[in-house]
C-alpha cells in the first residue's frame, strides 16, 4: 500500500478555493523528489496539472500552486476560482505519475444554492450553537414572532412567541425578544443536527405588513483533520469542544464500516480492549478540552476517529464533535521494539526502549500504565534518577546501548509487576512505546544470598552463582543508587580450564568489600551483560553494623544458593530473615547514606569470578 496519504474527498462550491494537503514519509529521497497533482482521465492515465518543479498546466494557470514542506513530510496544492468542470478524480503523489507512490483524491465542486435576495448565511458545525437574527419594524413589535423552516414549497413552524416549539427542536431552541427599542429578535438553536440544515424564514406580524427575513443554515460535519503517524509510534488527539460541554462526559470513538462509532475510550471508564495498555485519556482542562494518547500504533488502528461529549459517553446526534482521519505509515522509522518481555518471579527483566536517535540528549522515562478510569502512567524512573521510592534497589534506567535505545532493568520481580509499561522521552512524542511485562513460571538463573549484614572495618564477601549458559558473558557487580548502578572494579585473573569448559553445574562471581565502611550500606546487583546489552540481574541488600565480635565476615559460596527462607549463618555472617524486606528502612535505622560516587573505589571493593572449586577465574 502506498505510504502517501491525503483527503479522500474534497468538496467545495463554485468560485471558492480549496487547499489539499498530502503527506509522505519524510525520508531524504522523498523530501527532494518531484511532487505532483494530476487528474485521472478515462484512459487511466494521470495528466499532471501542477508539480513541485514549477510546471502548471494551462487550465490551472494563475489559479493553482503546489508547495512542498520537506521538514514536515507534506505538500499542499491550492486551487482557486473553482468551477463545476474541476469536479473529478485526482492523485497527489511523489516521483513519476504512474509509479504508485500516490493517493487518490475525489474533488466535487457543486453549484452554490440559489438563495432569495438578502438571505443571511449561517455556517455552523454539527453539535454547535447558532443564533439567527431576525429584524422587524416598530409596528410589528407587539405582534407574534416566529421562525419557519422551508421544506420544498411548504413552511413548517419551528418556534413562535406564543410558546410553540416544534418537537424536533424540543429542549434545544429558544426565541428571545429584546426589551423595548431593540427591533430585532433572535432564535438560538443548540446542539445542531445535520437535519437542521436548510432555509429558514423569520417572521414578525402577519398580513401584508409582516416582516420577513431568510436565513440559510448550513450544518457541516467537521472536516476530519488528517493525521499521519508511523507504525509502532504514538498519536495524540487533542479535543476542544467548548465550555458549554465542559462538565459533560467525553469520549473518543472510531467510525466502523456500518458508519456507527465504536467507543475507544471515555471518561465513564469504558475502554476498547484492543487498546489495553496503550491508551490514556488525559484529564480535562478547565475549558473542557482533553487529549487521548495512543501508543504502539498498528495498521488496524487506521480510520476515522471522533471525539465528543455526551452524558452517555458515546456519540449522539446533535452534540459537538471533532474528527480525525488517521493513516498509519508502514514505512516506519520506529523500530520493532519488544511488545512483550517475560521474566520469572524473583528474577529480572532488561527492557530495551527505542527513542529518536536524533535526540540523544533528551530525558528518558519509564512509567507504569494503569487502566483504572481514564488510564494514567505514573513515572517510575527517569534518566536523572529514580522517581518512585517503592522501586528502590530494584529499578534502574541506563543510557546504554545508546544510538536510539536505552535500557530499563527491573529485578526482584513479583506477579504484581506484570502489566504494561511505557518508554518515553521529553523529545519526540511519537516515539512513545508500550511493553508488557509477563511473569512466567521458572527460576532465576543468578543466585545471591538474601539480605546480609556486614560489620564495620571487616571483610565482606558476597557470592553470585551463575549457570553455564552465562559462562561466555561478562559478569559484574554494581552498587545501586537512585541515579544508576555504579559498576565495581573487577579482578580478571584469566580463565581457568574448568571455567572455559564450564563443566560444573554453576559458576561464581564474588564481590569483596574490604574493609566495610558505613558508605557500603545499600543495594548491590550481580548481573550479566554482553557489551552494552544487559541480561539478568540479582539484588542483595547489605546492612552495616558496628563491630561486635572479631573475625572476618564471609558468606560461604557453598551456602550462597540456600533457599530464600533459610538463614545462612556461615563464618559469622548473620543473614536477615527473609521477610520480603524491600525497604531497607524496615531494618536499618533511619539513616540516609549519601552516595559518594565511587564508594567502592580503589582496592576496597573487588569482584572475583571463579568456579566453585577454585578462586582463580575471569569476570569476562
Amino acid at each position: 500500500k502506498s505510504p502517501v496519504f491525503g483527503p479522500q474527498e474534497v468538496s467545495s462550491v463554485e468560485g471558492n478555493s480549496v487547499s489539499i494537503k498530502c503527506y509522505y514519509p519524510p525520508t531524504s529521497v522523498n523530501r527532494h523528489t518531484r511532487k505532483y497533482w494530476c487528474r485521472k482521465g478515462a484512459s487511466g492515465r494521470c495528466i499532471t496539472l501542477v508539480s513541485s518543479e514549477g510546471y502548471v498546466s494551462s487550465n490551472y494557470a494563475g489559479r493553482a500552486n503546489l508547495t512542498n514542506f520537506p521538514e514536515n513530510g507534506t505538500f499542499v496544492v491550492n486551487i482557486a476560482q473553482l468551477s463545476r468542470d474541476d469536479s473529478g478524480h485526482y492523485k497527489c503523489g511523489l516521483g513519476i505519475n504512474s509509479r504508485g507512490l500516490s493517493f487518490d483524491v475525489s474533488l466535487e465542486v457543486s453549484q452554490g444554492p440559489e438563495l432569495p435576495n438578502g438571505t443571511e448565511v449561517y455556517t455552523v458545525d454539527v453539535g454547535r450553537t447558532v443564533t439567527i437574527k431576525c429584524p422587524f419594524k416598530t409596528e410589528n413589535a407587539p405582534k407574534t414572532k416566529a421562525l419557519y423552516k422551508k421544506i420544498g414549497q411548504t413552511s413548517v413552524l419551528v418556534i413562535d412567541s406564543r410558546n410553540y416549539v416544534n418537537p424536533n427542536y424540543k429542549d434545544r431552541i429558544r426565541l428571545r425578544i429584546p426589551g423595548t427599542g431593540q427591533l430585532i429578535f433572535t432564535v438560538v438553536i443548540d446542539r445542531l443536527r445535520l437535519s437542521d440544515h436548510g432555509l429558514y424564514l423569520c417572521q414578525a406580524g402577519d398580513g401584508s405588513n409582516r416582516d420577513e427575513k431568510n436565513a440559510d443554515l448550513q450544518v457541516l460535519e467537521p472536516e476530519p483533520e488528517l493525521v499521519y503517524e508511523d507504525l509502532r509510534g504514538s498519536v495524540t488527539f487533542h479535543c476542544a469542544l467548548g465550555l458549554e460541554v465542559a462538565n459533560v462526559a467525553k469520549f473518543l470513538c472510531r467510525v466502523n464500516s456500518r458508519e456507527t462509532c465504536d467507543v475507544v475510550i471515555n471518561t465513564l471508564g469504558k475502554r476498547d480492549s484492543a487498546f489495553e495498555g496503550r491508551i490514556l485519556l488525559n484529564p480535562q482542562d478547565k475549558d473542557g478540552s482533553f487529549s487521548v494518547v495512543i501508543t504502539g500504533l498498528r495498521k488496524e488502528d487506521e480510520g476515522r476517529y471522533l471525539c465528543g461529549a455526551h452524558s452517555d459517553g458515546q456519540l449522539q446526534e446533535g452534540w459537538p464533535i471533532q474528527a480525525w482521519q488517521l493513516f498509519v505509515n508502514e514505512e516506519s522509522t520506529i523500530p520493532r521494539s519488544p511488545t512483550v518481555v517475560k521474566g520469572v518471579a524473583g528474577g529480572s527483566v532488561a527492557v530495551l526502549c527505542p527513542y529518536n536517535p536524533k535526540e540523544s540528549q533528551s530525558l528518558k522515562y519509564w512509567c507504569l500504565w494503569e487502566g483504572a478510569q481514564n488510564g494514567r502512567c505514573p513515572l517510575l524512573v527517569e534518566s536523572q534518577g529514580l522517581v518512585q521510592e517503592q522501586y528502590e534497589g530494584r529499578l534502574s534506567l541506563l543510557q546504554e546501548p545508546g544510538n536510539g535505545t536505552f535500557t530499563v532493568i527491573l529485578n526482584q520481580l513479583t506477579t504484581q509487576d506484570a502489566g504494561f509499561y511505557w518508554c518515553l522521552t521529553n523529545g519526540d512524542t511519537r516515539w512513545r512505546t508500550t511493553v508488557e511485562i509477563k511473569i512466567i513460571e521458572g527460576e532465576p538463573n543468578l543466585k545471591v544470598p538474601g539480605n546480609v549484614t556486614a560489620v564495620l572495618g571487616e571483610t565482606l564477601n558476597i557470592p553470585c552463582h551463575f549457570p553455564c549458559k552465562f559462562s561466555s558473558y561478562e559478569k559484574y557487580w554494581c552498587k545501586w543508587s537512585n541515579t544508576g548502578c555504579q559498576t565495581l572494579p573487577s579482578q580478571d585473573e584469566g580463565p581457568s580450564e574448568a571455567f572455559v569448559n564450564c563443566d560444573e553445574n554453576s559458576r561464581l562471581v564474588s564481590l569483596t568489600l574490604n574493609p566495610v565502611t558505613r558508605a557500603d550500606e545499600g543495594w548491590y546487583w550481580c548481573g550479566v551483560k554482553q557489551g552494552h546489552f544487559y541480561g539478568e540481574t540479582a539484588a542483595v541488600y547489605v546492612a552495616v553494623e558496628e563491630k561486635k565480635v572479631a573475625g572476618s565476615r564471609y558468606v560461604s559460596p557453598a551456602k550462597a544458593d540456600a533457599a530464600p527462607d533459610e538463614k545462612v549463618l556461615d563464618s559469622g555472617v548473620r543473614e536477615i530473615e527473609n521477610k520480603a524486606i524491600q525497604d531497607p528502612r524496615l531494618f536499618a535505622e533511619e539513616k540516609v547514606v549519601a552516595d559518594t560516587g565511587d564508594q567502592a573505589g580503589g582496592s576496597r571493593a573487588s569482584v572475583d569470578s571463579s568456579s566453585s572449586e577454585e578462586q582463580g577465574g575471569s569476570s569476562k
Epitope: 519488544p338 517475560k342 546501548p401
Partner: nanobody
C-alpha cells in the same frame, strides 16, 4: 496468531539421525525466537534448543549439546532440528514453539543474546505446535 506444524519424526535406530522441521504461518515469523521441547511418556516437557529471530544466537540443553543443531530459514518461515547420534533416551514427542523476542529488528533495537531470556521454560513461549513423535530403538 501463529500456527506451527512439525514434521520429520519417526522411528530410527540408536546412533542414527533425523531432521525435524517446523513450518510457521501467520504473524511475522522473523520477530520470534523458535524453540524445540520434548516430552517423554510420564515426564514433564523438557527444553531442547532455541534459536534467536535472526539465527545469530542459539542455546542447547546440556543433554543434547554437540549432537543436536537448531537452524532456521526466515525466507521459508521454517525452523529445523538436526538430531545426530540419537540415543534411546531421546525418545519423546518433539514440540516446536515460538515466543516474541525483544529486539527483533534493526536499526535501533539490536538483538540480545537468547541466553538472556528465560527461553528454557515452556511458559516463555506464546505458540506451540501439535508435536511429532521420535522413537529411538536400541
Amino acid at each position: 496468531q501463529v500456527q506451527l506444524v512439525e514434521s520429520g519424526g519417526g522411528l530410527v535406530q540408536a546412533g542414527g539421525s533425523l531432521r525435524l522441521s517446523c513450518a510457521a504461518s501467520g504473524r511475522t515469523f522473523s520477530s520470534y525466537a523458535m524453540g524445540w521441547f520434548r516430552q517423554a511418556p510420564g515426564k514433564e516437557r523438557e527444553f531442547v534448543a532455541v534459536i534467536s529471530w535472526s539465527g545469530g544466537s542459539t542455546y542447547y540443553a546440556d543433554s543434547v549439546k554437540g549432537r543436536f543443531t537448531i537452524s532456521r530459514d526466515n525466507a521459508k518461515n521454517t525452523v529445523y532440528l538436526q538430531m545426530n547420534s540419537l540415543k534411546p533416551e531421546d525418545t519423546a514427542v518433539y514440540y516446536c514453539a515460538s515466543g516474541e523476542q525483544p529486539g527483533s529488528n534493526r536499526p535501533y533495537i539490536p538483538e540480545q543474546p537468547i541466553e538472556f531470556m528465560p527461553t528454557d521454560y515452556p511458559s516463555w513461549y506464546d505458540y506451540w505446535g501439535q508435536g511429532t513423535q521420535v522413537t529411538v530403538s536400541s
